[in-house]
């Protein structure tokens, strides 16, 4: 039977707004990723900032509702915004426990002024786990 959806929770210092209220934080100790049990959806999200082929996690947590993309089993990020020249924000939504912890690859940002190469790439069949 399904459990309430549980996602990795992370918010980079200085990030505006918080999604902490969209779930209940689990007491996981210090050495494990922080986990949040979603209150209003069965969907996790992740946001990464890609700058010069280096990806940094910005936010991870629960979505406020189930919407397109939430049926995905894995985090497959797509480019969303350009917060500054040379950097691109990638976001993913997915609907399995802790699916927002990692991404298998970042697609090419594919827009003017941004390198068209793939972001940090995992070896075939592997995933990159974000170090939180």
């Amino acid at each position: 039977p399904p459990n309430r959806r549980t996602c990795v929770f992370f918010e980079a210092p200085g990030v505006r707004g918080s999604t902490k209220t969209l779930g209940e934080l689990l007491d996981t100790g210090t050495e494990l990723p922080r986990a949040i049990r979603c209150l209003y959806s069965r969907c996790c999200f992740g946001i990464w900032n890609l700058t010069q082929d280096r990806a940094q996690v910005e936010m991870q947590g629960c979505r406020d509702s189930d919407e397109p993309g939430c049926e995905s089993l894995h985090c497959d990020p797509s480019p969303r915004a350009h917060p500054s020249p040379g950097s691109t924000l990638f976001t993913c939504s997915c609907g399995t426990d802790f699916c927002n912890a990692n991404y298998s690859h970042l697609p090419p940002p594919g827009s003017p002024g941004t390198p068209g190469s793939q972001g940090p790439q995992a070896a075939p069949g592997e995933s990159i786990w974000m170090a939180l």
Epitope: P1, P2, N3, R4, L26, L39, D66
Partner: antibody, heavy 113, light 112 residues
Framework: QVQLVQSGAEVKVPGASVKMSCKAS????????VSWVRQSPGQGLEWIGE????????NFNEKFKGRVTLTVDKSTSTAYMELRSLRSDDTAVYYC??????WGQGVLVTVSS | DVVMTQSPLSLPVTLGQPASISCRSS???????????LEWYLQRPGQSPRLLIY???NRFSGVPDRFSGSGSGTDFTLKISRVEAEDVGVYYC?????????FGQGTKLEIK
Amino acid sequence: QVQLVQSGAEVKVPGASVKMSCKASGYTFTDYWVSWVRQSPGQGLEWIGEIYPKNGVSNFNEKFKGRVTLTVDKSTSTAYMELRSLRSDDTAVYYCTRQRDYWGQGVLVTVSS
Amino acid sequence: DVVMTQSPLSLPVTLGQPASISCRSSQSLEYGDGYTYLEWYLQRPGQSPRLLIYGVSNRFSGVPDRFSGSGSGTDFTLKISRVEAEDVGVYYCFQATHDPNTFGQGTKLEIK
């Protein structure tokens, strides 16, 4: 087919600890929570806690917090539960379950002086 | 903690006849994600519990269609359309909506 095979019965004295195992097969161990439930003699069922094998994140019934440790060995697809500071009312059958759909055969733990 | 109250606690039934077990929770079991984490288990004598129903009304694989679950909010029912000898045992409702997850006290079904 999905199987959860638990370790054998244990007899312990009050104040001791017990660590039991639950070996999973027939599915991808890291994709499902492993829950632990106990059943005291002639009593109902009581949820102890759960662990997600992929990353070790666990969630507990407050009643057992501080006395229970849940761990996994991904290389052998085995989950473990340790219960410390045993009391006579911890005498029970302890079950592991794969996210509550498939259950192990149970481990009878008897706490007696 | 959420209290799960089952009735009746003992249920003598004639083979081939229907049976019904009620489960009431002290708080609503509908979660914010719209799902109701209510399950039913059967524990046959000397065996481990076995999942019958999850999400109020979804039969687990291999569970005969004579078992059905219904309800919402705080009131739930397990029905057996025609009781068979292998249905003897203790039936438990269980909620996974609120921490800690809790079980009902059990309903013992026996053949008259």
